[in-house]
Each structure stands twice: as structure tokens, then as C-alpha cells.
Amino acid sequence: EINGSANYEMFIFHNGGVQILCKYPDIVQQFKMQLLKGGQILCDLTKTKGSGNTVSIKSLKFCHSQLSNNSVSFFLYNLDHSHANYYFCNLSIFDPPPFKVTLTGGYLHIYESQLCCQLK
């Protein structure tokens, strides 16, 4: 298992929510990506392929997510101060072998300007 800080911008704020970007290498074909808040699994997404190369995408812990060819984005909404924490992208690579797990993360700071706007 490889542990480290994300060497890219992991948190993108918009409209009182945050997009948490979990990157993986382009060469990875099949994987599981989990978003951890501290030690708790918040979200996950698994991509596999069958014997006919058909793609299956599954989530056991569903969050709004977006898959690209080198990243999974998880979206958290209605931010408040309780969201401030360490978040980790836990990537399990199934294919290509060998099986490998990598953990990258960063601290989500919550500032007043990023909180969801309340109507006065």
C-alpha cells in the first residue's frame, strides 16, 4: 500500500458543494475507488470488464460520482463545518496486475465563503 498526499488539486468547490477528485493512471483498466472520510467509507465505485470486454460499474455506497478515463469524482453537497476532515482516495487496482492498493489524500478546509448560501 502506498500512502501519500495528492499531488494535484483534490478539492474543487462550487455552489456550496465540493467535487473530490480521485485520480488513477490511464493504464488502469479495472479498479475499485473508495472515498474515505477519516477511516469511514463514504462512497465507492468499482469498474470491471467481462469476458466480452463489456464494462460494469457498481457502487455499494452510493454518492453522486463521475467517471473519466483517469479519475473518479465524488460530489458532496450542502457543505457545513462538520465536513472539514481528512479525505482519502483508496484505489484498488485489479487490472493490469499485480493487484495494488494506493491511498492518497488531503485535508478539506471549510471556509465561510464555501458554505451553502442561505437566503436572508
Epitope: 463489456t54 487490472d95 496486475p97
Partner: antibody, heavy 117, light 111 residues
């Protein structure tokens, strides 16, 4: 140790039906796509069907589409193949196989299906 | 559907000698960095066994006398020094798209 044990084969008349089962153990069944592959006596391997981890995606060989149905019960760690409208050319050993991400990495011993009058 | 062909249909090789099996696909099996081509060994009375995946990567536990090569449409399985336990039928197989298909097999015997 991964184990796949097929059952349900036998002799059936043309036009008849059979349901094959495959009991899986030694791995997390719900994490893997599963397939059926058949082999007619003295002949080569022919892919029949596959199903994804949750049972929501299924694919079939043109030879069996519309006649065979693959399914799975993850609570029972069991794979199924319902075979209807059987023909003489469906006579074969039917293997249950695990699709191990990039190849069929585990196989059962097979169950023989004979379609004859 | 992609058609897989193999040559020769059978071959007999002396113990310790090299055996070479060829496989050809009717369209390229290369996608990105990967050739979606696998090789299986089937000994008499047994189910098949996965030997090689992605055209050239040995499955865990497979002896290093087995090697795979090739790209696109032309592939080769080589047994560098044939052993008695290698007597079997060898199949190539693609998983580039659905339906996946197997080659007709090549029977390897001892001369």
C-alpha cells in the same frame, strides 16, 4: 482454494429443458463476472454466456441467444444456466468458469449434457 | 464476430525441444496498451487452465518455459523445452469484444 462444482447435466430429448447449477466457494463470488463455456465431445471450446457481478448484465453466444438464460444468486454463491429448446448440437460438457479480470482463471470439472431422442 | 485460427492443428516435438504454436485473429486485438489475447492448456480429461494473458503475461504458477508473444492479429505460444507433462491441447482466445471466441486448438504430443 477456488472451487466450482457444476451439476444438473444429463440426457434430455430434443426440444426439452435443463437447468445447470454451479456452486462456487473459496472466493467472494459477488466480486466476479462468471461464464459458461461448453465443449462438444472431441471438439474445441465454445463460449456460451456471461453475467456480471450483480446479475444486471448478461451476454450470450449467437448459438444460444433466446434459448438459454444465465442467472446467479449471490446469497447462495451459485451460478445457473437455464437451457430451453435444446438441440442435438447443444450436446457438450458445460464448464462453469470464473472470469478473473483478464482470463478464465478457474474452471469446474464440467457437467455433460446429452440431447438425443 | 472475430474469428480465431491456429496453426498447426497438431505437432509432435522431442522432449527438451521447442514447440511453437501460432494464432491469428480476423481483426486486431490491440486496444490501448493491451492485446486482448489469452492462451489455455487442456490436458486429457481435465478442464482448461489459463497459461498466458494479455498475449505475453504468464499466469501465476505457470513455468517460465511457456511464453507468449505477438501483437495486433498475430500471436505465438512457445514452449522452450517440452516436458512430458506439456502434452495437451492449446487454445488461443480473445476477449476484445463480445462474443469472445476460441481458436480451434493445437494438439501437442511427444515425438
Amino acid at each position: 482454494e477456488v472451487q466450482l462444482v457444476e451439476s444438473g447435466g444429463g440426457l434430455v430429448q430434443p426440444g426439452g429443458s435443463l437447468r445447470l447449477s454451479c456452486a462456487a466457494s473459496g472466493f467472494t463470488f459477488s466480486d466476479y463476472w462468471m461464464d459458461w463455456v461448453r465443449q462438444a465431445p472431441g471438439k474445441g471450446l465454445v463460449w456460451v454466456s456471461n453475467i456480471d457481478e450483480s446479475g444486471s448484465i448478461t451476454e450470450y453466444s449467437p448459438f444460444v441467444k433466446g434459448r438459454f438464460t444465465i442467472s446467479r444468486d449471490n446469497a447462495k454463491n451459485t451460478l445457473y444456466l437455464q437451457m430451453n429448446s435444446l438441440r442435438a448440437e447443444d450436446t457438450a460438457v458445460y464448464y462453469c468458469t470464473r472470469w478473473g479480470r483478464f482470463g478464465f482463471d478457474s474452471w469446474g470439472q464440467g457437467t455433460l449434457v446429452t440431447v438425443s431422442s | 464476430d472475430i474469428v480465431m485460427t491456429q496453426s498447426p492443428d497438431s505437432l509432435a516435438v522431442s522432449l527438451g525441444e521447442r514447440a511453437t504454436i501460432n494464432c491469428k485473429s480476423s481483426q486486431s486485438l490491440l486496444s490501448g496498451s493491451f492485446n486482448y489475447l489469452t492462451w489455455y492448456q487442456q490436458k486429457p480429461g481435465q478442464p482448461p487452465k489459463l497459461l498466458i494473458f494479455y498475449a505475453s503475461t504468464r499466469q501465476t504458477g505457470v513455468p517460465d518455459r511457456f511464453s507468449g508473444s505477438g501483437s495486433g492479429t498475430d500471436f505465438t505460444l512457445t514452449i522452450s523445452s517440452l516436458q512430458a507433462e506439456d502434452v495437451a491441447v492449446y487454445y488461443c482466445h480473445h476477449h476484445y469484444n463480445a462474443p469472445p471466441t476460441f481458436g480451434p486448438g493445437t494438439k501437442v504430443d511427444i515425438k
